[in-house]
């Protein structure tokens, strides 16, 4: 008789999840000499320990503390790039501007990027069939709690000028319910962070509106100002040219507004 299994609304654990986490960990520690000391078997054991045998709607930040400890990493606190709903461009940017870092450029972010995982209460099995959906099932699921935990820590570490890349093509350019809006904004430390600079990325070719005047950006400015952090905003009208100019800042066409 097959064991009854909880059916969740979200996709199941990414296939070859353990192998993927281990392979990514080894690759990351090979590429980043400052993380060579990390033992990837221990990282996997800590990762697994955070959700295996636990009810996938009952995960806490505490469950991830052993993993956080093992993955402790110092990134230059004044070189942090946050993003919301525009991950690919943010990652393309840090691939070119190597001294800046998104969360996914850190070990823990790199390990989990684009992966899904969950377990089952009281069994050591990984659930490859389905995992809880944040909206339809529960918010305290293994994936959501992981990203909340690492995002909070990443924001807490930031200092000086923090940059955030926002998607100007969306109806809510700043969304209070995004990880950036619900976690990172509220965990920037006013005693360390002087300014939050938003880069609003335009999608349309002929879109010359000043999206820094968007009501949701004004809302972000209000939240940030109330936290005693200065706010500035820039329109990035041509993201393709923006990346090109990051690659070749001497290019004559890069002196004009991007």
């Amino acid at each position: 008789v097959p064991r009854w299994r909880q059916q969740w609304s979200g996709p199941g654990t990414t296939k070859r999840f353990p192998e993927t986490v281990l392979a990514r960990c080894v690759k990351y520690t090979e590429i980043h000499p400052e993380m060579r000391h990390v033992d990837c078997q221990s990282v996997w054991d800590a990762f697994k320990g955070a959700f295996i045998s636990k009810h996938p709607c009952n995960i806490t930040e505490e469950d991830y503390q052993p993993l956080m400890k093992l993955g402790t990493q110092t990134v230059p606190c004044n070189k942090i790039l946050l993003w919301s709903r525009i991950k690919d461009l943010a990652h393309q940017f840090t691939q070119v501007q190597r001294d800046m870092f998104t969360l996914e450029d850190t070990l823990l972010g790199y390990l989990a990027d684009d992966l899904t995982w969950c377990g089952e209460f009281n069994t050591s099995k990984i659930n490859y069939q389905s995992c809880p959906d944040w909206r339809k099932d529960c918010s305290n699921n293994p994936v959501s709690v992981f990203w909340k935990t690492v995002s909070r820590r990443f924001a807490e570490a930031a200092c000086d000028v923090v940059h955030v890349m926002l998607n100007g093509s969306r109806s809510k350019i700043f969304d209070k319910n995004s990880t950036f809006g619900s976690v990172e904004v509220h965990n920037l430390q006013p005693e360390k962070v002087q300014t939050l600079e938003a880069w609003v990325i335009h999608g349309g070719r002929e879109d010359s509106r000043d999206l820094c005047q968007d009501p949701t950006i004004k809302e972000l400015e209000s939240i940030i100002s109330k936290r005693n952090i200065q706010f500035s905003c820039k329109n990035i009208y041509r993201p393709d040219k923006f990346l090109q100019c990051v690659k070749n800042p001497e290019d004559s066409s890069c002196t004009s507004e991007i």
């Epitope: 353990p18 192998e19 281990l22 392979a23 080894v26 090979e30 000391h37 990390v38 033992d39 990837c40 078997q41 221990s42 054991d45 800590a46 697994k48 320990g49 052993p66 093992l70």
Partner: antibody, heavy 118, light 109 residues
Amino acid sequence: EVQLVESGGGLVQPGRSLRLSCAASGFTFSSYAMSWVRQAPGKGLEWVAVISYDGSNKYYADSVKGRFTISRDNSKNTLYLQMNSLRAEDTAVYYCAHLRFGYGMDVWGQGTTVTVSS
Amino acid sequence: QTVVTQEPSLTVSPGGTVTLTCASSTGAVTSDHYPCWFQQKPGHPPRALVYSTDTIHSWTPARFSGSLLGGKAALTVSGVQPEDEADYYCLLYYGGARVFGGGTQLTVL
């Protein structure tokens, strides 16, 4: 300097017990998985057991499962191997190894000799 | 019980090239087995040479290289030196447990 020093080896009768220790220094012991490996006289290496950084995960070779127990005390930077129901075929040099996943065992102790004989 | 098989012995001339292989009884060796290679000389503990299939340690001479070859892990020594005479062991990872190969005695004649 990373160092591993094994102790506790000796001559023991079949069926008896012995506990090996491995004192670690020069690295953050509590962040690493650790292993025991043995080598019988004139024979090859045999992986015995591995323990995760916090002691929560342990894996054993089939030849020692149920008889040997690997453990660690992170406050003392020490790895242990409790060996029960010893047999003549357990006679070997036992090495403690600092294991980094994917990197193989990149630091080894000098080994401690266990002889099981009546 | 998983068995990892190596050539028991190989002989090579100084300056020559030799390839040692490592096969798994469970099927093809892949990068998921994270093959590692060790060198051991009489009276000494083993010394790691290659990890993660093909990456050499900082102390490993460049004449040593690792690869996957026809479903096996392989260690190639190019321009063999007299001091390379030793026993060589591969180690494979099986989801927590590890298994050493039986070892290859390399003679440099």
